[in-house]
């Protein structure tokens, strides 16, 4: 008996061939001996089976002695033995229909679990192997689970169902709902405008939800909600915003926030959360703001940074085109009695400059100028 595997919702074509290459009498029936379809000359006649409206053949092939049974929109319960009777011979085909579905939704939040469930006909004992977009293989029986979904798990999952040495492949598109970056740092000189961007790592037709940015300033003892907003069909509307600082928010995606100016009291880290409609849990993105200030008071030239800096960052003060006068893994450096010229305050990481602030030191009889 020939075995054919089918996929729920798909179309399958079961073949039946006669030795004579001409249109002759044939019919297909199921294991309950109920006629599915047959021919009367060049016309197709349908039996009273449950498949009636989903069963078909290819009349164009009959003259070649081929009498296929086509079943559209396959259901698990279509799994059966189908018998083609042509001339005085019988051809039996066992059709096994499988379905593979994601537990609840194919759009899941980062960190959530994905469960794939295999629907199979009674009496079958299939094995399933799935390969994630990042190449991770998982194996199982009727259910397969992947915990702690990551952004790289977004994409097409390819699952192979094995039964009777035959295989059928399923492709399931999984969308992991997350921000493109888990965390970002913005480096700004005091007084500059600050732009925070929160691009999403997915696109959907309609996006609805609400969000909030909580901010923990380095100088503050507790965190504070800076802004709350709603998202409706990818349109952003601000619900509530603090007076200090008075953030501005873009009306379209990606989520975009503007801080009018970087000040030491704003330096710190924030957490933007986004709760999506019909989803349990929230998306998170951490954002950090580092602010630099260079000042000269009397005979002291000082450079300071505020905000979350790593211990390996180097803060330096140097006269333009000269070697650094002072360089330390600290958040403040200074030079006493600086010579006249353009001084540079640099915050760098392994030689890469992250932030730079210039200050002009005039000869001792004049006041300093900050460009």
């Amino acid at each position: 008996k020939k075995v054919v595997l089918g996929k729920k919702g798909d179309t399958v074509e079961l073949t039946c061939t006669a030795s004579q290459k001409k249109s002759i009498q044939f019919h297909w029936k199921n294991s309950n001996q109920i006629k599915i379809l047959g021919n009367q000359g060049s016309f197709l006649t349908k039996g009273p089976s449950k498949l009636n409206d989903r069963a078909d053949s290819r009349r164009s092939l009959w003259d070649q002695g081929n009498f296929p049974l086509i079943i559209k929109n396959l259901k698990i319960e279509d799994s059966d033995t189908y018998i083609c009777e042509v001339e005085d011979q019988k051809e039996e085909v066992q059709l096994l229909v499988f379905g593979l579905t994601a537990n609840s939704d194919t759009h899941l939040l980062q960190g959530q679990s994905l469960t794939l469930t295999l629907e199979s006909p009674p009496g079958s004992s299939p094995s399933v192997q799935c390969r994630s977009p990042r190449g991770k293989n998982i194996q199982g029986g009727k259910t397969l689970s992947v915990s702690q979904l990551e952004l790289q798990d977004s994409g097409t999952w390819t699952c192979t169902v094995l039964q009777n040495q035959k295989k059928v492949e399923f492709k399931i598109d999984i969308v992991v709902l997350a921000f493109q970056k888990a965390s970002s740092i913005v480096y700004k000189k005091e007084g500059e405008q600050v732009e925070f961007s929160f691009p999403l790592a997915f696109t959907v037709e309609k996006l609805t939800g609400s969000g909030e940015l909580w901010w923990q300033a380095e100088r503050a003892s507790s965190s504070k909600s800076w802004i709350t907003f709603d998202l409706k069909n990818k349109e952003v509307s601000v619900k509530r915003v603090t007076q200090d600082p008075k953030l501005q928010m873009g009306k379209k995606l990606p989520l975009h926030l503007t801080l009018p100016q970087a000040l030491p009291q704003y330096a710190g880290s924030g957490n933007l959360t986004l709760a999506l409609e019909a989803k349990t849990g929230k998306l998170h993105q951490e954002v950090n703001l580092v602010v630099m200030r260079a000042t000269q008071l009397q005979k002291n030239l000082t450079c300071e940074v505020w905000g979350p800096t790593s211990p390996k960052l180097m803060l330096s003060l140097k006269l333009e085109n000269k070697e650094a006068k002072v360089s330390k893994r600290e958040k403040a450096v200074w030079v006493l009695n600086p010579e006249a010229g353009m001084w540079q305050c640099l915050l760098s990481d392994s030689g890469q400059v992250l932030l730079e602030s210039n200050i002009k030191v005039l000869p001792t009889w004049s006041t300093p100028v900050q460009p």
Epitope: K35, Q40, F43
Partner: antibody
């Protein structure tokens, strides 16, 4: 030419069975399905079932599946219909028919009259 | 099962005039460009005679006075001009799916 010759009239008692025949000639018997149709006096036509003469498989109208049994004898080109547990409701003319180029019944036997009477 | 409703139940037409019989199916009987509707004529004591198959095809040996038309669920048999010998009962029958079903018939009388 195509001919379907049916057996003669039958007078049977209620509860009994009857077996009628339909002899085909003028064509290759196994190339065409034989259908059976019932017509009560002054009434319409009802399809009973069909026999695929090539394989011998038969399919029935749900209404007649416990009443009729369709068989063929390929060697002698004869199709048979047996009716069981007869009642007055089974008194009718029974035709065998074969399709033509289309799906219509182009060739008919002359009919077998079955009368069920005590 | 597909139910066929034929009208009128009886019809009297003058010799040489047109007789029109209609047949309505409870669902479409079309498949792959063909309409699985057939028309028969039956005279007393005789088996039915196939006139039209697949809605509009004239069976061989049937006079061209008989024409069939229609598709989907609505079909018509026309006889023009009617002749004396056309006095009979006419049936439509679908062969789209098993069981094939017949309508109740139309008795045609020639005046």
């Amino acid at each position: 030419q195509v001919q379907l010759q049916q057996s003669g009239p039958e007078l049977v008692k209620p509860g009994a069975s009857v077996k009628m025949s339909c002899k085909a000639s003028g064509y290759t018997f196994t190339d065409y399905v034989i259908n059976w149709v019932k017509q009560r006096t002054g009434q319409g036509l009802e399809w009973i079932g069909e026999t695929y003469t090539g394989s011998g498989s038969s399919y029935y109208n749900e209404k007649f599946k416990d009443k009729a049994t369709l068989t063929v004898d390929k060697a002698s080109n004869i199709a048979y219909m047996q009716l069981s547990s007869l009642t007055s409701e089974d008194s009718a003319v029974y035709f065998c028919a074969r399709r033509g180029k289309g799906t219509g019944f182009a060739f008919w036997g002359q009919g077998t009259l079955v009368t069920v009477s005590a | 099962d597909i139910v066929l409703t034929q009208s009128p139940a009886s019809l009297a037409v003058s010799l040489g005039q047109r007789a029109t019989i209609s047949c309505k199916a409870s669902q479409s009987v079309d498949y792959d460009g063909d309409s699985y509707m057939n028309w028969y004529q039956q005279k007393p004591g005789q088996p039915p005679k196939l006139l039209i198959y697949a809605a509009s095809n004239l069976e061989s040996g049937i006079p061209a006075r008989f024409t069939g038309s229609g598709s989907g669920t609505d079909f018509t048999l026309n006889i023009h001009p009617v002749e004396e010998e056309d006095t009979a009962t006419y049936y439509c029958q679908q062969s789209y799916e098993d069981p094939p079903t017949f309508a109740g018939g139309t008795n045609l009388e020639i005046k």
